[in-house]
């Protein structure tokens, strides 16, 4: 229903705390360089204005759209052009073009320093002094680094953060209480970020239909007892929620997500038997819980998929009558039978089925043509299954760090033109798939591995889009989202690449490396590994292992030496010489 004042409506629905949090996230995602204080001031002004509209919906400007209100606020910021360059040109446009312009200027890789966590004592002091400001800083810092972070979910992570601090800051050993818990939240939030970015990419590049297909597959796997009409309703609602968040309409998004959670909890009987635990929780926890609820038990009496989609006499008529509905029912029926497949794989199968009907239904004898379609799915299913087996075997053999290195070598050979920091980031993220997925039960591995890899590769594509340097990467990134992972997997050594010349300074290290945290040490070593591969793209695994073992030994020796600086300056050049010889 239409409301006289959109801002009053959202303020009333969301409540002051969530309203302010979402407005802060929105501003931080649009203007990523502004300080917390600048944004906090704007948020307060918007909140005060919303309250006047709640008191009187007919007050001046209360009838304006949220985009108009927020856009006007952003455009009133002093020194916009000096700080943001051509983004300031957006302010010359009218809505909705202005908002579209802001969206186009969101930066997936802003040049901001890594978000450093203060030490425990300092963190607890500032948290106790002003929990609201502390949480505001958290929302601001995460949102500006992740401009597509799913806003209502970020509120959930802030709430988690709050609970951890409340608990741990009361403990004697704050550090050992906080570190593992906050690390856990950080890891989950980073995964959430890349997954949501993938959803927004799907929406931006391929439209609502593509996202809705993803949602139908995912929901059908989770709720195999829900009928097609129920799944379609949930997929339509979920598509609307994600469209709003991806489009920067964060208040609407959070409000509609709350509505969807309410609907699901009121209709558990027709959706799933597994929702009750989630539905007993407060709003943010409830919505989060529903988004990752375990799969319901599959109905025991499902007929073979072939009955309706191959053997039925009216396959082509049903397809002709309503293509999207027929393909949707195929995706639904196939997905509910296969919680053990990735959504990407299910969408590839649906695409194959669609292509088969397009071809076969135009022939004189369609049934003879499409009769083998399910058998033709086999190679499509085997490929990701083999990928999972090979990679999990390798992970189990090498451990996470070794597995990341193996991936780093592989991907540097596939796309040596890509910048080393991007390759290292991608390989580290791709390598985490082992820890995340390979320890799961067999039937959960494939969906975990492939859907996670797809999300990470989407980030690789986004970063590469900014500065395209590799034809291999461009080729894989310009295809459909579901084909990207198989495309990257199939890439081999880039034969067109002219190896980098060997520069001694690239492999020269100093004693400061010894005091770095383990993660930073690993990144330094992985940076060197990528540079070695760029120098010798066809180096064997054995050669690279020899060099990396030597390198690790060198670091270990010099970091234990009494005079570290002398050790690095005398042993370093010897290491460089040995490396050159080993790779010759």
């Amino acid at each position: 229903e239409a409301h006289k004042s959109e801002i009053a409506h959202r303020y009333n629905d969301l409540g002051e705390q969530h309203f302010k949090g979402l407005v802060l996230i929105a501003f931080s995602q649009y203007l990523q360089k502004c300080s917390y204080d600048e944004h906090a001031k704007l948020v307060q002004e918007v909140t005060d204005f919303a309250k006047t509209c709640v008191a009187d919906e007919s007050a001046a400007n209360c009838d304006k759209s949220l985009h108009t209100l927020f856009g006007d606020k952003l455009c009133a910021i002093p020194n916009l052009r000096e700080n943001y360059g051509e983004l300031a040109d957006c302010c010359t446009k009218q809505e909705p073009e202005r908002n579209e312009c802001f969206l186009q200027h969101k930066d997936d890789n802003p040049s901001l320093p890594p978000f450093e966590r203060p030490e425990a004592e300092a963190m607890c002091t500032s948290f106790k002094e002003n929990p609201t400001t502390f949480m505001g800083h958290y929302l601001h810092e995460v949102a500006r680094r992740h401009p597509y972070f799913y806003a209502p979910e970020l509120l959930y992570y802030a709430e988690q953060y709050n609970e951890i601090l409340t608990q741990c800051c009361a403990e004697a050993d704050k550090e050992s209480c906080l570190t593992p818990k906050l690390d856990g939240v950080k890891e989950k939030a980073l995964v959430s970020s890349v997954r949501q970015r993938m959803k927004c990419s799907s929406m931006q590049k391929f439209g609502e239909r593509a996202f809705k297909a993803w949602a139908v597959a995912r929901l059908s796997q989770t709720f195999p007892n829900a009928d097609f009409a129920e799944i379609t309703k949930l997929a339509t609602d979920l598509t609307k929620v994600n469209k709003e968040c991806c489009h920067g309409d964060l208040l609407e998004c959070a409000d509609d997500r709350a509505e969807l959670a309410k609907y699901m909890c009121e209709n558990q009987a027709t959706i799933s038997s597994k929702l009750q635990t989630c539905c007993d929780k407060p709003l943010l926890k409830k919505a989060h819980c529903l988004s990752e609820v375990e799969h319901d038990t599959m109905p025991a009496d499902l007929p073979a998929i072939a009955a309706d989609f191959v053997e039925d006499q009216e396959v082509c008529k049903n397809y002709a009558e309503a293509k999207d509905v027929f393909l949707g029912t195929f995706l639904y029926e196939y997905s509910r039978r296969h919680p053990d497949y990735s959504v990407s794989l299910l969408l590839r199968l649906a695409k194959k089925y669609e292509a088969t009907l397009e071809k076969c239904c135009a022939e004189a004898n369609p049934p003879a043509c499409y009769g083998t379609v399910l058998a033709e799915f086999q190679p499509l299913v085997e490929e990701p299954k083999n990928l999972v087996k090979t990679n999990c075997d390798l992970y189990e053999k090498l451990g996470e760090y070794g597995f990341q290195n193996a991936i780093l070598v592989r991907y540097t050979q596939k796309a040596p033109q890509v910048s080393t920091p991007t390759l290292v980031e991608a390989a580290r993220n791709l390598g985490r798939v082992g820890t995340k997925c390979c320890t799961l039960p067999e039937d959960q591995r494939l969906p975990c591995v492939e859907d996670y890899l797809s999300a990470i590769l989407n980030r690789v594509c986004l970063l590469h889009e900014k500065t395209p340097v590799s034809e291999h990467v461009t080729k894989c990134c310009s295809g459909s989202l579901v084909e990207r992972r198989p495309c990257f997997s199939a890439l081999t050594v880039d034969e067109t690449y002219v190896p980098k010349e060997f520069k001694a300074e690239t492999f020269t290290f100093h004693s400061d490396i010894c005091t770095l945290p383990e993660k930073e040490k690993q990144i330094k070593k992985q940076t060197a590994l990528a540079e070695l591969v760029k120098h010798k793209p066809k180096a064997t695994a054995e050669q690279l292992k020899t060099v990396m073992d030597d390198f690790a030994q060198f670091l270990d020796t010099c970091c234990k030496a009494a005079d570290k600086d002398t050790c690095f300056s005398t042993e370093g050049p010897n290491l460089v010489t040995r490396c050159k010889d080993a790779l010759a």
Partner: nanobody
Framework: KVQLVESGGGLVQPGNSLRLSCAAS????????MSWVRQAPGKGLEWVSS????????LTADSVKGRFTISRDNSKNTLYLQMNSLRAEDTAVYYC????????SSQGTLVTVSS
């Protein structure tokens, strides 16, 4: 909504000819193979002939081969069945179907061959 409407049936003497038409709507006609099937009184459905979406490929049952010809006009969204040298055993209700289906989803047109 897919609609198929057959016409052209009637009473005809053995040895004579008839031309059946099927007007199609509600879908991209040229993207789908089409068929004619028939049902004689008291019998099951029998496949008669099929044609590809482009009209380049046709298939015809042995029982009518050399006598019946299937064709289509994609610009008019219409399927045809030219029936020559009709026999008493060709008496049936004729239906057009999408994609080789042996399921009636239209009214059909009655062809009676009798002297």
């Amino acid at each position: 909504k897919v609609q198929l409407v057959e016409s052209g049936g009637g009473l005809v003497q053995p040895g004579n000819s008839l031309r059946l038409s099927c007007a199609a709507s509600g879908f991209t006609f040229s993207s789908f193979g089409m068929s004619w099937v028939r049902q004689a009184p008291g019998k099951g459905l029998e496949w008669v002939s099929s044609i590809s979406g482009s009209g380049s490929d046709t298939l015809t049952a042995d029982s009518v081969k050399g006598r019946f010809t299937i064709s289509r006009d994609n610009s008019k969204n219409t399927l045809y069945l030219q029936m020559n040298s009709l026999r008493a055993e060709d008496t049936a209700v004729y239906y057009c179907t999408i994609g080789g289906s042996l399921v009636r989803s239209s009214q059909g047109t009655l062809v009676t061959v009798s002297s």
